[in-house]
Interface confidence: low
């Protein structure tokens, strides 16, 4: 990674070091595997919704009343914890991008083939919005041996 020169970059680096992005990686891997399992069906039809509680006992209807608050938007354990971690980057779009890039890097070796890599990348780009957070406008998620185009 490049040298971090600015105060904000140092803060981002320490945020990234503190962050546990593993739940995000697990959530995304589960999601693309679930999507592959349900390939060929309408993923959002009520009887076949891959997110439905009957198919994923960890997942509650994200906007149904919860014991804590009717706004409880719990999805899977991993997504809840992932959103918690990404929330730390909400006010720093560059740092949010760094977090997404780190997730991509960490999982790149586990992705089998170009199609799965593209699917993972697509889900990763959607991740901030699924947590209700702003997504970085420009964020290069290509994993290369050379340096990446920075924010």
């Amino acid at each position: 990674r490049q040298q971090w020169e600015l105060q904000g970059d140092r803060r981002c680096q320490s945020q990234l070091e503190r962050a546990n992005l593993r739940p995000c990686e697990q959530h995304l891997m589960q999601k693309i595997q679930r999507d592959e399992d349900s390939y060929g069906r309408d993923p959002y039809s009520p009887s076949q919704d891959p997110y439905s509680p009957s198919q994923d006992p960890d997942r509650r209807d994200p906007y149904s009343p919860s014991p804590y608050d009717r706004r409880g938007a719990g999805s899977s354990q991993h997504q809840e914890r992932c959103c918690n971690e990404l929330n730390e980057f909400e006010n720093n779009q560059r740092c949010m991008c760094e977090a997404l890039q780190q997730i991509m890097e960490n999982q790149s070796d586990r992705l089998q083939g170009r199609q799965q890599e593209q699917q993972f990348k697509r889900e990763l780009r959607n991740l901030p919005q699924q947590c209700g957070l702003r997504a970085p406008q420009r964020c290069d998620l290509e994993v290369e041996s050379g340096g990446r185009d920075r924010y």
Epitope: P46, S64, D69, R71, G72, G74, S75
Partner: antibody, heavy 129, light 106 residues
Framework: QVQLVQSGAEVRKPGSSVKVSCKAS????????ITWVRQAPGQGLEWMGW????????NYAQKFQGRVTITADESTSTAYMELSSLKSEDTALFYC??????????????????????WGQGTLVTVSS | ETVLTQSPATLSLSPGERATLSCRAS??????LAWYQHKPGQAPRLLIY???NRATGIPARFSGSGSGTDFTLTISSLEPEDSAVYYC????????FGGGTKVEIK
């Protein structure tokens, strides 16, 4: 920039139903809740319910429970609000709006707080015999 | 359900004057309160979210403050185009709007 375009004005008889559409263009549709709000003549704004297209989940205000159905078609980026058993008091302007739904999480449970940042132009529904 | 009470019902001020609109919640909503401007024949417009954050494109003369149960929308120097009804709205409990404050420019 996301825009929401609603269907045109409707006139209905008491006891019938009305279905209003709200088409999104110029941005993501699936991830943000689409909310429906109504304003009766001379009255304030009233939340009716919402849908999150990506999850196909809905929630409705108690006042409208059983009479309102909100649906979404991801393929056309369109949300729909159907209100049944219409009464003359249902004469109102109906708005759809995108909910920016900012999430915050605590003890493993995520919550959202709502602010409607993009609105449709409104659809006037008149219920009259 | 959380009830939002806005005051005053009507505010009649001259251009350049400062407008202070109040919104009181029947129970704490933290900082999760939004303000909207609504003009006749137009869709409502988001001004402020999370109590004090100005929405995109909103002039700096609009500011929000408060937390818990008491919130304020301030228009520092009224312009003729600020004539509208202003609503507060909370999203921590079932979504509710306040009854609105009508701002008239003399």
């Amino acid at each position: 920039q996301v825009q929401l375009v609603q269907s045109g004005a409707e006139v209905r008889k008491p006891g019938s139903s009305v279905k209003v559409s709200c088409k999104a263009s110029g941005g993501t549709f699936s991830n943000n809740p689409i909310t429906w709000v109504r304003q009766a003549p001379g009255q304030g704004l009233e939340w009716m319910g919402w849908i999150i297209p990506i999850f196909n989940t809905t929630n409705y205000a108690q006042k409208f429970q059983g009479r309102v159905t909100i649906t979404a078609d991801e393929s056309t980026s369109t949300a729909y609000m159907e209100l049944s058993s219409l009464k003359s008091e249902d004469t109102a302007l109906f708005y759809c709006a995108r909910d920016r739904a900012h999430a915050y999480c605590n003890n493993g449970v995520c919550y959202t707080t709502d602010a409607f940042d993009v609105w449709g132009q409104g659809t006037l529904v008149t219920v009259s015999s | 359900e959380t009830v939002l009470t806005q005051s005053p019902a009507t505010l009649s001020l001259s251009p350049g004057e400062r407008a202070t609109l109040s919104c009181r919640a029947s129970q704490s909503v933290g900082r999760y309160l939004a303000w909207y401007q609504h003009k006749p024949g137009q869709a409502p417009r988001l001004l402020i979210y999370d109590a004090s954050n100005r929405a995109t494109g909103i002039p700096a003369r609009f500011s929000g403050s408060g937390s818990g149960t008491d919130f304020t929308l301030t228009i520092s120097s009224l312009e003729p185009e600020d004539s509208a009804v202003y609503y507060c709205q909370q999203g921590t409990d079932w979504l509710t709007f306040g009854g609105g404050t009508k701002v008239e420019i003399k």
